[in-house]
Protein backbone atom coordinates (compact mmCIF):
# COMPACT_ATOMS: atom_id res chain seq x y z
CA UNK A 1 0.00 0.00 0.00
CA UNK A 2 1.15 3.54 -0.73
CA UNK A 3 1.52 5.58 2.45
CA UNK A 4 -0.26 8.93 2.40
CA UNK A 5 0.09 11.54 5.14
CA UNK A 6 -2.61 14.21 5.24
CA UNK A 7 -3.10 17.21 7.50
CA UNK A 8 -6.34 17.28 9.48
CA UNK A 9 -8.88 19.65 7.97
CA UNK A 10 -7.20 19.69 4.56
CA UNK A 11 -8.66 18.12 1.40
CA UNK A 12 -7.20 14.90 0.01
CA UNK A 13 -7.53 13.35 -3.45
CA UNK A 14 -6.70 9.67 -3.98
CA UNK A 15 -6.28 8.59 -7.62
CA UNK A 16 -7.93 5.46 -8.91
CA UNK A 17 -5.29 4.04 -11.23
CA UNK A 18 -6.48 2.59 -14.50
CA UNK A 19 -9.92 4.23 -14.30
CA UNK A 20 -11.31 5.85 -17.46
CA UNK A 21 -11.02 9.62 -17.12
CA UNK A 22 -14.75 10.16 -17.71
CA UNK A 23 -17.94 8.22 -17.04
CA UNK A 24 -19.07 5.57 -17.75
CA UNK A 25 -16.60 3.96 -15.37
CA UNK A 26 -16.53 0.53 -13.82
CA UNK A 27 -14.87 1.25 -10.53
CA UNK A 28 -15.43 0.87 -6.86
CA UNK A 29 -13.75 2.43 -3.84
CA UNK A 30 -13.58 0.44 -0.60
CA UNK A 31 -12.56 2.04 2.65
CA UNK A 32 -11.76 0.65 6.05
CA UNK A 33 -11.32 3.58 8.43
CA UNK A 34 -12.38 4.84 11.83
CA UNK A 35 -15.77 5.61 10.28
CA UNK A 36 -16.37 2.03 9.19
CA UNK A 37 -16.40 -1.30 10.95
CA UNK A 38 -15.60 -3.42 7.93
CA UNK A 39 -15.35 -2.20 4.34
CA UNK A 40 -17.56 0.60 3.09
CA UNK A 41 -18.12 0.62 -0.67
CA UNK A 42 -18.42 3.93 -2.54
CA UNK A 43 -19.27 4.05 -6.22
CA UNK A 44 -19.39 6.90 -8.78
CA UNK A 45 -23.20 6.72 -8.86
CA UNK A 46 -23.62 6.61 -5.12
CA UNK A 47 -23.83 10.22 -3.96
CA UNK A 48 -25.25 10.30 -0.45
CA UNK A 49 -24.57 10.90 3.25
CA UNK A 50 -20.93 9.86 2.83
CA UNK A 51 -20.29 12.77 0.43
CA UNK A 52 -19.44 15.02 3.38
CA UNK A 53 -16.54 12.70 4.15
CA UNK A 54 -15.55 11.04 0.85
CA UNK A 55 -17.00 11.07 -2.62
CA UNK A 56 -16.04 9.72 -6.02
CA UNK A 57 -15.17 12.46 -8.51
CA UNK A 58 -16.12 12.27 -12.22
CA UNK A 59 -12.56 11.16 -13.06
CA UNK A 60 -12.80 8.25 -10.59
CA UNK A 61 -10.59 9.77 -7.90
CA UNK A 62 -11.78 9.74 -4.30
CA UNK A 63 -12.14 13.20 -2.78
CA UNK A 64 -12.03 13.81 0.97
CA UNK A 65 -13.01 17.47 1.49
CA UNK A 66 -11.58 17.77 5.01
CA UNK A 67 -9.58 14.88 6.40
CA UNK A 68 -10.28 13.93 10.02
CA UNK A 69 -8.81 11.55 12.59
CA UNK A 70 -11.53 9.01 11.74
CA UNK A 71 -10.32 8.91 8.14
CA UNK A 72 -7.11 7.11 9.06
CA UNK A 73 -7.11 3.70 7.46
CA UNK A 74 -7.04 1.79 4.18
CA UNK A 75 -8.50 3.04 0.88
CA UNK A 76 -8.70 0.70 -2.12
CA UNK A 77 -9.88 1.28 -5.64
CA UNK A 78 -10.65 -1.42 -8.16
CA UNK A 79 -11.11 -0.15 -11.71
CA UNK A 80 -11.66 -1.72 -15.09
CA UNK A 81 -10.55 0.12 -18.20
CA UNK A 82 -12.34 0.07 -21.58
CA UNK A 83 -10.45 -3.09 -22.57
CA UNK A 84 -11.54 -4.96 -19.46
CA UNK A 85 -8.15 -4.77 -17.74
CA UNK A 86 -8.44 -4.52 -13.97
CA UNK A 87 -6.20 -2.19 -11.93
CA UNK A 88 -6.06 -1.92 -8.16
CA UNK A 89 -4.91 1.05 -6.09
CA UNK A 90 -4.17 0.70 -2.40
CA UNK A 91 -3.52 3.56 0.04
CA UNK A 92 -2.73 3.68 3.74
CA UNK A 93 -3.80 7.11 5.01
CA UNK A 94 -2.41 8.61 8.21
CA UNK A 95 -3.38 12.04 9.45
CA UNK A 96 -1.60 14.64 11.52
CA UNK A 97 -2.08 18.05 13.07
CA UNK A 98 0.71 20.43 14.03
CA UNK A 99 -0.07 22.14 17.35
CA UNK A 100 0.32 25.81 18.09
CA UNK A 101 3.79 26.92 19.23
CA UNK A 102 4.49 25.39 22.64
CA UNK A 103 4.67 27.74 25.61
CA UNK A 104 6.38 27.69 28.99
CA UNK A 105 3.93 28.66 31.71
CA UNK A 106 4.43 29.14 35.47
CA UNK A 107 8.11 29.78 34.84
CA UNK A 108 10.44 30.56 37.74
CA UNK A 109 12.34 33.83 37.66
CA UNK A 110 14.84 32.59 40.24
CA UNK A 111 16.30 29.19 41.09
CA UNK A 112 18.27 28.22 44.20
CA UNK A 113 21.53 26.34 43.70
CA UNK A 114 21.85 22.99 45.43
CA UNK A 115 18.14 22.31 45.89
CA UNK A 116 15.40 21.03 43.51
CA UNK A 117 13.47 23.88 41.78
CA UNK A 118 10.49 23.91 39.43
CA UNK A 119 11.67 25.69 36.28
CA UNK A 120 8.26 25.81 34.55
CA UNK A 121 5.62 23.83 32.67
CA UNK A 122 5.77 23.41 28.91
CA UNK A 123 2.36 23.17 27.21
CA UNK A 124 1.56 22.12 23.65
CA UNK A 125 -2.07 22.14 22.46
CA UNK A 126 -3.74 20.58 19.43
CA UNK A 127 -1.40 17.88 18.14
CA UNK A 128 -2.12 14.58 16.39
CA UNK A 129 -0.61 12.09 16.87
CA UNK A 130 0.38 13.11 20.39
CA UNK A 131 4.10 13.77 19.75
CA UNK A 132 6.58 14.52 22.53
CA UNK A 133 7.92 17.46 24.54
CA UNK A 134 11.59 17.75 25.44
CA UNK A 135 13.58 20.29 27.45
CA UNK A 136 16.87 21.96 26.55
CA UNK A 137 19.46 23.74 28.68
CA UNK A 138 21.64 26.18 26.75
CA UNK A 139 20.55 24.45 23.54
CA UNK A 140 21.49 20.93 24.69
CA UNK A 141 18.84 18.27 25.48
CA UNK A 142 18.16 17.69 29.16
CA UNK A 143 17.93 14.02 30.07
CA UNK A 144 15.36 13.25 32.80
CA UNK A 145 16.63 11.44 35.90
CA UNK A 146 20.19 12.60 35.26
CA UNK A 147 22.13 15.26 37.17
CA UNK A 148 19.22 16.49 39.26
CA UNK A 149 16.81 16.74 36.31
CA UNK A 150 13.28 15.41 36.65
CA UNK A 151 10.28 15.77 34.34
CA UNK A 152 6.60 15.17 35.08
CA UNK A 153 4.51 14.61 31.94
CA UNK A 154 0.77 14.59 31.26
CA UNK A 155 -1.15 13.88 28.05
CA UNK A 156 -4.83 14.77 27.61
CA UNK A 157 -7.11 14.21 24.62
CA UNK A 158 -9.90 16.61 23.65
CA UNK A 159 -13.20 14.68 23.86
CA UNK A 160 -14.60 16.20 20.66
CA UNK A 161 -11.67 16.95 18.37
CA UNK A 162 -9.46 14.03 19.42
CA UNK A 163 -6.43 16.34 19.42
CA UNK A 164 -3.81 16.08 22.16
CA UNK A 165 -2.62 18.53 24.81
CA UNK A 166 0.79 17.74 26.28
CA UNK A 167 2.24 19.13 29.51
CA UNK A 168 5.76 18.70 30.84
CA UNK A 169 6.92 20.09 34.18
CA UNK A 170 10.70 20.50 34.59
CA UNK A 171 12.49 20.30 37.95
CA UNK A 172 16.24 20.92 38.21
CA UNK A 173 18.86 21.15 40.92
CA UNK A 174 21.37 23.77 39.75
CA UNK A 175 24.97 23.03 40.70
CA UNK A 176 26.67 25.46 43.11
CA UNK A 177 29.02 27.74 41.25
CA UNK A 178 27.33 27.01 37.92
CA UNK A 179 25.87 29.32 35.27
CA UNK A 180 24.12 32.24 37.02
CA UNK A 181 21.70 32.73 34.04
CA UNK A 182 20.96 29.34 32.42
CA UNK A 183 18.77 29.32 29.29
CA UNK A 184 15.91 26.78 29.26
CA UNK A 185 13.65 26.02 26.31
CA UNK A 186 11.18 23.33 25.41
CA UNK A 187 10.40 21.79 22.05
CA UNK A 188 7.55 19.77 20.58
CA UNK A 189 8.50 16.90 18.24
CA UNK A 190 5.62 15.65 16.06
CA UNK A 191 4.60 12.00 16.21
CA UNK A 192 4.89 11.70 12.43
CA UNK A 193 8.28 11.95 10.76
CA UNK A 194 9.45 14.66 8.35
CA UNK A 195 8.03 17.49 10.42
CA UNK A 196 10.42 19.80 12.23
CA UNK A 197 10.28 20.46 15.95
CA UNK A 198 8.60 23.57 17.35
CA UNK A 199 10.53 25.38 20.08
CA UNK A 200 9.31 27.73 22.78
CA UNK A 201 10.78 31.13 23.48
CA UNK A 202 13.64 30.60 25.96
CA UNK A 203 13.49 31.53 29.63
CA UNK A 204 16.51 32.69 31.67
CA UNK A 205 15.97 32.43 35.40
CA UNK A 206 18.63 33.75 37.76
CA UNK A 207 20.41 31.18 39.93
CA UNK A 208 20.75 32.33 43.51
CA UNK A 209 23.69 30.94 45.47
CA UNK A 210 22.88 30.61 49.17
CA UNK A 211 25.89 31.79 51.25
CA UNK A 212 27.23 28.77 53.12
CA UNK A 213 26.45 29.37 56.77
CA UNK A 214 29.62 29.76 58.86
CA UNK A 215 29.32 28.60 62.42
CA UNK A 216 28.14 30.96 65.13
CA UNK A 217 30.97 31.11 67.68
CA UNK A 218 30.29 31.63 71.38
CA UNK A 219 33.30 32.93 73.33
CA UNK A 220 33.20 32.90 77.12
CA UNK A 221 35.38 34.94 79.56
CA UNK A 222 36.80 33.53 81.76
CA UNK A 223 37.57 30.53 79.62
CA UNK A 224 35.73 27.41 80.70
CA UNK A 225 32.88 29.42 82.23
CA UNK A 226 33.86 28.75 85.86
CA UNK A 227 33.93 31.83 88.12
CA UNK A 228 34.11 32.65 91.83
CA UNK A 229 30.98 34.00 93.47
CA UNK A 230 30.59 37.72 92.76
CA UNK A 231 32.80 37.46 89.68
CA UNK A 232 31.85 38.60 86.13
CA UNK A 233 31.29 36.43 83.07
CA UNK A 234 31.29 37.88 79.54
CA UNK A 235 29.67 35.90 76.70
CA UNK A 236 30.38 37.09 73.12
CA UNK A 237 28.50 35.80 70.08
CA UNK A 238 30.65 36.02 66.92
CA UNK A 239 28.89 35.74 63.57
CA UNK A 240 30.94 36.23 60.37
CA UNK A 241 27.87 36.87 58.17
CA UNK A 242 27.18 40.30 56.67
CA UNK A 243 24.99 42.18 57.32
CA UNK A 244 25.19 41.44 61.05
CA UNK A 245 22.30 39.31 62.19
CA UNK A 246 20.22 39.87 65.30
CA UNK A 247 21.56 38.01 68.35
CA UNK A 248 19.30 36.63 71.07
CA UNK A 249 20.34 34.69 74.14
CA UNK A 250 19.12 31.44 75.65
CA UNK A 251 19.58 29.96 79.11
CA UNK A 252 18.82 26.32 79.67
CA UNK A 253 16.98 26.25 76.33
CA UNK A 254 14.69 29.15 77.26
CA UNK A 255 14.98 32.56 75.50
CA UNK A 256 16.11 35.33 77.84
CA UNK A 257 13.80 38.39 77.76
CA UNK A 258 16.52 40.79 76.67
CA UNK A 259 16.97 43.11 73.69
CA UNK A 260 19.19 41.72 70.87
CA UNK A 261 22.93 42.13 71.47
CA UNK A 262 26.11 40.23 70.50
CA UNK A 263 27.51 40.48 74.04
CA UNK A 264 25.99 39.25 77.31
CA UNK A 265 27.63 40.32 80.62
CA UNK A 266 26.81 38.50 83.84
CA UNK A 267 28.19 40.71 86.69
CA UNK A 268 28.33 39.60 90.36
CA UNK A 269 27.63 36.00 89.60
CA UNK A 270 25.39 34.20 92.00
CA UNK A 271 24.02 30.62 92.15
CA UNK A 272 20.94 31.67 90.17
CA UNK A 273 23.17 32.54 87.17
CA UNK A 274 24.53 29.04 86.80
CA UNK A 275 23.33 27.16 83.75
CA UNK A 276 23.83 26.46 80.06
CA UNK A 277 24.00 29.49 77.76
CA UNK A 278 23.82 29.76 73.97
CA UNK A 279 23.20 32.51 71.43
CA UNK A 280 20.86 32.49 68.43
CA UNK A 281 21.75 34.49 65.30
CA UNK A 282 18.76 35.33 63.11
CA UNK A 283 19.59 36.10 59.46
CA UNK A 284 16.96 37.74 57.26
CA UNK A 285 17.65 35.21 54.48
CA UNK A 286 18.42 31.99 56.38
CA UNK A 287 16.39 31.97 59.55
CA UNK A 288 17.85 31.24 63.02
CA UNK A 289 21.23 29.59 63.72
CA UNK A 290 22.21 28.54 67.24
CA UNK A 291 25.70 28.44 68.73
CA UNK A 292 27.15 25.65 70.83
CA UNK A 293 26.08 25.80 74.49
CA UNK A 294 28.47 26.72 77.30
CA UNK A 295 28.07 25.96 80.95
CA UNK A 296 28.49 28.74 83.51
CA UNK A 297 29.29 27.54 87.04
CA UNK A 298 30.46 28.95 90.38
CA UNK A 299 33.75 27.81 91.93
CA UNK A 300 33.58 27.70 95.70
CA UNK A 301 36.82 28.87 97.45
CA UNK A 302 39.34 26.06 97.35
CA UNK A 303 37.78 24.35 94.28
CA UNK A 304 39.81 23.94 91.10
CA UNK A 305 37.07 23.92 88.43
CA UNK A 306 33.39 24.14 87.69
CA UNK A 307 31.04 22.43 90.10
CA UNK A 308 29.78 19.28 88.49
CA UNK A 309 26.23 19.51 87.30
CA UNK A 310 25.18 22.33 89.58
CA UNK A 311 22.56 24.53 87.96
CA UNK A 312 21.16 27.53 89.77
CA UNK A 313 17.59 28.72 89.91
CA UNK A 314 15.91 30.44 87.06
CA UNK A 315 16.45 33.91 88.53
CA UNK A 316 18.54 36.11 86.27
CA UNK A 317 20.37 38.05 88.97
CA UNK A 318 21.95 41.20 87.62
CA UNK A 319 22.58 41.09 83.85
CA UNK A 320 24.35 43.65 81.77
CA UNK A 321 24.17 43.78 77.99
CA UNK A 322 26.85 45.60 76.06
Amino acid sequence: AQNITARIGEPLVLKCKGAPKKPPQRLEWKLNTGRTEAWKVLSPQGGGPWDSVARVLPNGSLFLPAVGIQDEGIFRCQAMNRNGKETKSNYRVRVYQIPGKPEIVDSASELTAGVPNKVGTCVSEGSYPAGTLSWHLDGKPLVPNEKGVSVKEQTRRHPETGLFTLQSELMVTPARGGDPRPTFSCSFSPGLPRHRALRTAPIQPRVWEPVPLEEVQLVVEPEGGAVAPGGTVTLTCEVPAQPSPQIHWMKDGVPLPLPPSPVLILPEIGPQDQGTYSCVATHSSHGPQESRAVSISIIEPGEEGPTAGSVGGSGLGTLALA
Epitope: E37, G48, P49, W50, S52, V53
Partner: antibody, heavy 119, light 107 residues
Framework: EVQLVESGGGLVQPGSSLRLSCAAS????????MTWVRQAPGKGLEWVAS????????YYPDSVKDRFTISRDNAKNSLYLQMNSLRAEDTAVYYC????????????WGQGTLVTVSS | DIQMTQSPSSLSASVGDRVTITCRAS??????VNWFQQKPGKAPRRLIY???NLADGVPSRFSGSRSGTDFTLTISSLQPEDFATYYC?????????FGGGTKVEIK
Protein backbone atom coordinates in the same frame (compact mmCIF):
# COMPACT_ATOMS: atom_id res chain seq x y z
CA GLU B 1 -29.20 27.37 21.51
CA VAL B 2 -29.93 25.81 18.10
CA GLN B 3 -33.15 27.17 16.61
CA LEU B 4 -34.87 26.31 13.33
CA VAL B 5 -38.04 28.18 12.36
CA GLU B 6 -40.05 27.15 9.30
CA SER B 7 -42.45 29.37 7.41
CA GLY B 8 -44.33 29.45 4.10
CA GLY B 9 -46.80 26.60 4.60
CA GLY B 10 -50.47 26.89 3.71
CA LEU B 11 -53.34 25.60 1.62
CA VAL B 12 -52.67 25.26 -2.11
CA GLN B 13 -54.34 23.58 -5.06
CA PRO B 14 -52.93 20.49 -6.78
CA GLY B 15 -50.45 21.41 -9.51
CA SER B 16 -49.47 24.70 -7.88
CA SER B 17 -46.18 25.74 -6.22
CA LEU B 18 -45.08 26.76 -2.76
CA ARG B 19 -41.78 27.88 -1.26
CA LEU B 20 -40.89 26.98 2.31
CA SER B 21 -38.23 28.82 4.28
CA CYS B 22 -36.27 27.90 7.39
CA ALA B 23 -34.42 30.49 9.48
CA ALA B 24 -31.50 28.98 11.40
CA SER B 25 -29.71 30.42 14.44
CA UNK B 26 -27.54 29.34 17.34
CA UNK B 27 -24.91 27.49 15.28
CA UNK B 28 -22.49 28.00 12.40
CA UNK B 29 -24.94 27.39 9.57
CA UNK B 30 -22.42 26.85 6.79
CA UNK B 31 -20.73 24.02 8.72
CA UNK B 32 -23.76 21.74 8.43
CA UNK B 33 -25.74 19.84 5.88
CA MET B 34 -29.45 20.65 6.11
CA THR B 35 -32.49 18.48 5.42
CA TRP B 36 -36.26 18.66 4.93
CA VAL B 37 -38.41 15.88 6.40
CA ARG B 38 -42.19 15.62 6.14
CA GLN B 39 -44.93 13.86 8.03
CA ALA B 40 -48.35 13.23 6.52
CA PRO B 41 -51.25 13.49 8.99
CA GLY B 42 -51.23 10.44 11.30
CA LYS B 43 -48.27 8.88 9.43
CA GLY B 44 -44.54 8.41 9.94
CA LEU B 45 -41.54 10.52 8.97
CA GLU B 46 -40.33 10.74 5.36
CA TRP B 47 -37.09 12.24 4.06
CA VAL B 48 -37.69 14.93 1.41
CA ALA B 49 -34.34 16.54 0.53
CA SER B 50 -30.82 17.27 1.78
CA UNK B 51 -28.18 19.81 0.81
CA UNK B 52 -24.48 19.89 1.66
CA UNK B 53 -22.95 22.75 3.64
CA UNK B 54 -21.73 24.67 0.59
CA UNK B 55 -25.01 24.24 -1.32
CA UNK B 56 -23.19 22.61 -4.25
CA UNK B 57 -24.78 19.18 -3.87
CA UNK B 58 -28.43 18.31 -3.36
CA TYR B 59 -30.13 14.98 -2.73
CA TYR B 60 -33.75 13.79 -3.15
CA PRO B 61 -35.80 10.62 -2.95
CA ASP B 62 -37.56 9.52 -6.15
CA SER B 63 -40.93 10.65 -4.78
CA VAL B 64 -40.03 14.35 -5.07
CA LYS B 65 -37.15 14.38 -7.56
CA ASP B 66 -37.68 16.90 -10.40
CA ARG B 67 -40.55 18.55 -8.51
CA PHE B 68 -38.84 19.82 -5.34
CA THR B 69 -35.65 21.89 -5.10
CA ILE B 70 -33.67 22.42 -1.90
CA SER B 71 -31.39 25.45 -1.67
CA ARG B 72 -29.65 27.55 0.96
CA ASP B 73 -28.31 31.04 1.50
CA ASN B 74 -25.41 30.81 3.93
CA ALA B 75 -25.15 34.59 4.18
CA LYS B 76 -28.71 34.70 5.50
CA ASN B 77 -28.57 31.45 7.54
CA SER B 78 -31.58 30.29 5.56
CA LEU B 79 -32.76 27.04 4.00
CA TYR B 80 -35.46 26.80 1.32
CA LEU B 81 -37.65 24.18 -0.31
CA GLN B 82 -39.25 25.07 -3.62
CA MET B 83 -42.17 22.71 -4.25
CA ASN B 84 -43.69 22.54 -7.74
CA SER B 85 -46.45 20.41 -9.25
CA LEU B 86 -47.88 19.74 -5.81
CA ARG B 87 -50.09 16.68 -5.30
CA ALA B 88 -52.58 15.72 -2.64
CA GLU B 89 -50.08 13.17 -1.30
CA ASP B 90 -47.62 16.02 -0.56
CA THR B 91 -49.96 17.19 2.22
CA ALA B 92 -47.88 17.03 5.40
CA VAL B 93 -46.09 18.95 8.12
CA TYR B 94 -42.71 19.89 6.68
CA TYR B 95 -39.79 19.99 9.12
CA CYS B 96 -36.47 21.72 8.61
CA UNK B 97 -33.69 19.71 10.28
CA UNK B 98 -29.97 20.09 10.83
CA UNK B 99 -27.74 17.42 9.33
CA UNK B 100 -28.29 14.66 6.82
CA UNK B 101 -24.76 13.33 6.33
CA UNK B 102 -22.90 10.60 8.22
CA UNK B 103 -21.19 12.99 10.61
CA UNK B 104 -24.46 14.12 12.16
CA UNK B 105 -27.39 12.16 10.83
CA UNK B 106 -30.16 14.51 11.88
CA UNK B 107 -29.95 16.17 15.27
CA UNK B 108 -32.12 19.30 15.62
CA TRP B 109 -35.59 19.90 14.17
CA GLY B 110 -37.80 22.92 13.67
CA GLN B 111 -41.41 22.92 14.84
CA GLY B 112 -42.71 22.33 11.31
CA THR B 113 -45.03 24.11 8.87
CA LEU B 114 -48.21 22.54 7.50
CA VAL B 115 -48.68 22.26 3.76
CA THR B 116 -52.17 21.24 2.60
CA VAL B 117 -52.71 20.36 -1.08
CA SER B 118 -56.40 20.20 -1.83
CA SER B 119 -58.86 21.42 -4.39
CA ASP C 1 -33.12 1.22 -1.13
CA ILE C 2 -32.58 0.30 2.49
CA GLN C 3 -35.68 -0.71 4.49
CA MET C 4 -35.85 -0.06 8.23
CA THR C 5 -38.33 -2.49 9.75
CA GLN C 6 -39.38 -1.22 13.17
CA SER C 7 -41.17 -3.39 15.71
CA PRO C 8 -43.51 -3.42 17.44
CA SER C 9 -45.65 -0.76 15.78
CA SER C 10 -47.29 -0.10 19.14
CA LEU C 11 -47.05 -1.32 22.70
CA SER C 12 -48.79 -0.76 26.02
CA ALA C 13 -46.69 -0.46 29.13
CA SER C 14 -46.82 0.80 32.69
CA VAL C 15 -44.66 3.33 34.49
CA GLY C 16 -41.49 1.57 35.67
CA ASP C 17 -41.56 -1.05 32.91
CA ARG C 18 -38.53 -1.86 30.79
CA VAL C 19 -39.35 -1.19 27.13
CA THR C 20 -37.44 -2.41 24.08
CA ILE C 21 -37.97 -1.23 20.49
CA THR C 22 -36.11 -2.74 17.53
CA CYS C 23 -35.21 -1.60 14.02
CA ARG C 24 -33.81 -4.06 11.50
CA ALA C 25 -31.94 -2.71 8.47
CA SER C 26 -32.30 -4.61 5.20
CA UNK C 27 -28.55 -4.23 4.62
CA UNK C 28 -25.44 -3.15 6.52
CA UNK C 29 -25.69 0.48 7.61
CA UNK C 30 -22.72 0.41 10.00
CA UNK C 31 -23.34 2.51 13.09
CA UNK C 32 -25.30 5.14 11.20
CA VAL C 33 -28.64 4.98 13.01
CA ASN C 34 -30.31 7.63 15.18
CA TRP C 35 -33.36 7.27 17.41
CA PHE C 36 -36.01 9.96 17.93
CA GLN C 37 -38.93 10.57 20.25
CA GLN C 38 -42.01 12.46 19.02
CA LYS C 39 -44.96 13.65 21.03
CA PRO C 40 -48.28 14.63 19.41
CA GLY C 41 -48.10 18.02 17.67
CA LYS C 42 -44.39 18.36 18.39
CA ALA C 43 -41.19 18.01 16.40
CA PRO C 44 -39.07 14.88 16.85
CA ARG C 45 -36.26 15.01 19.41
CA ARG C 46 -33.02 13.07 19.02
CA LEU C 47 -32.35 10.54 21.78
CA ILE C 48 -29.52 8.37 20.47
CA TYR C 49 -26.94 9.06 17.78
CA UNK C 50 -24.72 6.65 15.90
CA UNK C 51 -26.50 3.62 17.33
CA UNK C 52 -25.27 3.79 20.91
CA ASN C 53 -24.50 7.36 21.98
CA LEU C 54 -26.83 9.26 24.28
CA ALA C 55 -27.63 12.74 22.98
CA ASP C 56 -27.10 15.77 25.23
CA GLY C 57 -29.81 16.33 27.82
CA VAL C 58 -31.39 12.89 27.35
CA PRO C 59 -32.04 10.90 30.56
CA SER C 60 -29.76 7.91 31.11
CA ARG C 61 -32.73 5.51 31.21
CA PHE C 62 -32.58 5.64 27.40
CA SER C 63 -29.91 3.53 25.70
CA GLY C 64 -29.12 2.23 22.25
CA SER C 65 -27.43 -0.95 21.13
CA ARG C 66 -26.52 -2.66 17.90
CA SER C 67 -26.02 -6.22 16.77
CA GLY C 68 -25.16 -6.40 13.08
CA THR C 69 -28.13 -4.87 11.29
CA ASP C 70 -30.40 -4.96 14.36
CA PHE C 71 -30.68 -1.75 16.37
CA THR C 72 -32.41 -1.53 19.73
CA LEU C 73 -33.72 1.38 21.79
CA THR C 74 -34.24 0.50 25.46
CA ILE C 75 -36.04 2.52 28.14
CA SER C 76 -34.92 0.93 31.40
CA SER C 77 -37.73 2.29 33.56
CA LEU C 78 -40.60 3.95 31.71
CA GLN C 79 -41.62 7.37 33.05
CA PRO C 80 -44.94 9.21 32.48
CA GLU C 81 -43.25 11.66 30.08
CA ASP C 82 -41.94 8.78 27.91
CA PHE C 83 -45.34 7.95 26.40
CA ALA C 84 -44.75 8.98 22.79
CA THR C 85 -43.90 7.62 19.35
CA TYR C 86 -40.32 6.51 18.64
CA TYR C 87 -38.56 6.39 15.25
CA CYS C 88 -35.23 5.07 14.04
CA UNK C 89 -33.37 6.67 11.12
CA UNK C 90 -30.73 5.14 8.87
CA UNK C 91 -28.30 7.71 7.43
CA UNK C 92 -25.66 5.53 5.83
CA UNK C 93 -27.15 5.79 2.35
CA UNK C 94 -29.72 7.76 0.39
CA UNK C 95 -32.61 7.72 0.49
CA UNK C 96 -32.47 8.38 4.23
CA UNK C 97 -34.97 5.92 5.69
CA PHE C 98 -37.02 6.14 8.88
CA GLY C 99 -38.57 3.18 10.62
CA GLY C 100 -42.36 3.08 10.66
CA GLY C 101 -42.54 4.21 14.29
CA THR C 102 -43.49 2.61 17.61
CA LYS C 103 -46.27 4.16 19.65
CA VAL C 104 -45.75 3.62 23.39
CA GLU C 105 -49.09 3.89 25.19
CA ILE C 106 -50.14 3.68 28.82
CA LYS C 107 -51.44 0.26 29.78
Amino acid sequence: EVQLVESGGGLVQPGSSLRLSCAASGFTFNNYWMTWVRQAPGKGLEWVASIDNSGDNTYYPDSVKDRFTISRDNAKNSLYLQMNSLRAEDTAVYYCARGGDITTGIDYWGQGTLVTVSS
Amino acid sequence: DIQMTQSPSSLSASVGDRVTITCRASQDVGIYVNWFQQKPGKAPRRLIYRATNLADGVPSRFSGSRSGTDFTLTISSLQPEDFATYYCLEFDEHPLTFGGGTKVEIK
